[in-house]
């Protein structure tokens, strides 16, 4: 008796964070024996879509010509071979930006900060929101989620960084969201360039800061120190 069929790989092009109205293609890659591919969306009762494999049969394409709120969510795919259905793929979280107006991102006291000092990035929304995300350009993951404790709506979230090192330098954006759908984000804030000057300490991070030098700092979540912001928001690490 053969073991279970290997699970397929699921990904999105050009990526899994898509602006409203833009096109996105979801790919599911299985094996050369695949007869049919099926895409399931969380909380969708019927199979969300199904497609014949593309030659040479090891993958299928699911096209979304124009991104809307309805497409945002969590997907898994499967393939069917002559011996049955595969295990489900790892989930793909398709996020839509542009659902709400853009927040404002600023740095306190200033976006120009000396190494070893402290800085707080402040993300402010015009309307009350309960989730804020801070993104660093070219980072593999969102740096930080801040989510309100009990669904309380907030106009802002603080992202304290202390002590600052050269790793913290770069271009940041923030997004705001409502808790009822973490897959719907605001337009991105205008970019904020954080410039770290001087060397009050060795700019290379120490291992205690949970930044892997092997992978490179851009591949790791940023781990700012300091107290949890007093805004009633709770920190969630990615």
């Amino acid at each position: 008796q053969a073991g279970p069929l290997p699970k397929p790989t699921l990904w999105a092009e050009p990526g899994s964070v898509i602006s409203w109205g833009n096109s996105v293609t979801i790919w599911c890659q299985g094996t050369l024996e695949a007869r049919e591919y099926r895409l399931d969306k969380e909380e969708s009762p019927a199979p969300w879509d199904r497609q014949n494999p593309l030659e040479p049969k090891n993958k299928a394409r699911f096209s979304i010509p124009s991104m809307t709120e309805d497409y945002a969510g969590r997907y898994r795919c499967y393939y069917r071979s002559p011996v049955g259905w595969s295990q489900p793929s790892d989930p793909l979280e398709l996020v839509m930006t542009g659902a709400y107006s853009k927040p404002t991102l600023s740095a306190l006291p200033s976006p120009l900060v000396t190494s070893g000092k402290s800085v707080t990035l402040l993300c402010q929304s015009r309307s009350p929101m309960d989730t804020f995300l801070l993104i660093k350009e070219r980072a593999a993951h969102p740096l930080l989620h801040l989510r309100s404790e009990h669904g309380a709506q907030q106009h802002q979230a603080e992202f304290p960084m202390s002590p600052v090192t050269s790793v913290h330098g770069g271009t940041y954006r923030c997004f705001s969201s409502h808790g009822f759908s973490h897959y719907l984000l605001s337009h991105p804030s205008d970019p904020l360039e954080l410039i770290v000057s001087g060397s009050l300490e060795d700019p290379r991070p120490s291992p205690t800061r949970s930044v892997s030098t092997a992978a490179g700092p851009e591949d790791q979540p940023l781990m700012p120190t300091g107290s949890v912001p007093h805004s009633g928001l709770r920190r969630h690490w990615e």
């Epitope: 007869r35 969708s44 019927a46 199979p47 969300w48 879509d49 002559p82």
Partner: antibody
């Protein structure tokens, strides 16, 4: 019990369009794909396409891509098929059928069919 | 597209007979084969799905078998109400395709 209600007949002129309906009852409409099948007089069955009522996703037989458009109205649990630029070749009985979606990919419940006659 | 062929377009049998209707696919369809009954009034019903599984409410005198490209539907004890046309259909790949049908008549 599962029921798919289709009007009995439609008489249409050549070059015109017709929108056929299929009203579902007895089950959760958005939980099952819906198929449309064509049968010319004295002929076999031809699969036109399928639609997912929960999100409007469709798959078509290449042969019918420029002829048929499948849509749904979730509020009334009704599936529709619009046929455009009708000719005598489109005179046929059109069935809607519910997808079983498990082993076999069968169509487990069928409507009574709508007879479309294209004539001037 | 997968071509489904029912070589026998019509078949005459007596009540009580055992009747077998065959269907061939142009390629392996991995048991994704279904059988339908169409009555003279046009009513279509699913009989068998996935080669051999009986759909709910279908009498046990109907059975299906086969694998790869060759499949068959058997009616073990023909009754008057079985007078109909029988279609096979493959669900292995899109587009779904049907056989041409076998019309069953009483001798």
């Amino acid at each position: 019990q599962v029921q798919l209600q289709q009007p009995g007949a439609e008489l249409v002129k050549p070059g015109a369009s017709v929108k056929l309906s299929c009203k579902a009852s007895g089950y959760t409409f958005t939980s099952y794909w819906m198929h449309w099948v064509k049968q010319r007089p004295g002929q076999g069955l031809e699969w036109i396409g399928e639609i997912n009522p929960s999100n409007g996703r469709t798959n078509y037989n290449e042969k019918f891509k420029s002829k048929a458009t499948l849509t749904v109205d979730k509020s009334s649990s009704t599936a529709y098929m619009q046929l455009n630029s009708l000719t005598s070749e489109d005179s046929a009985v059109y069935y809607c059928a519910r997808d079983r979606y498990d082993e076999g990919n069968a169509m487990d419940y069928w409507g009574q069919g709508t007879s479309v006659t294209v004539s001037s | 597209d997968i071509v489904m062929t029912q070589t026998t377009s019509s078949l005459s049998a007596s009540l009580g007979d055992r009747v077998t209707i065959s269907c061939r696919a142009s390629q392996d369809i991995t048991n994704y084969l279904n059988w339908y009954q169409q009555k003279p009034d046009g009513t279509v019903k699913l009989l068998i799905y996935y080669t051999s599984r009986l759909h709910s409410g279908v009498p046990s005198r109907f059975s299906g078998s086969g694998s790869g490209t060759d499949y068959s539907l058997t009616i073990s004890n023909l009754e008057q109400e079985d007078i109909a046309t029988y279609f096979c259909q493959q669900g292995d790949t899109l587009p779904r395709t049907f056989g041409g049908g076998t019309k069953l008549e009483i001798k």
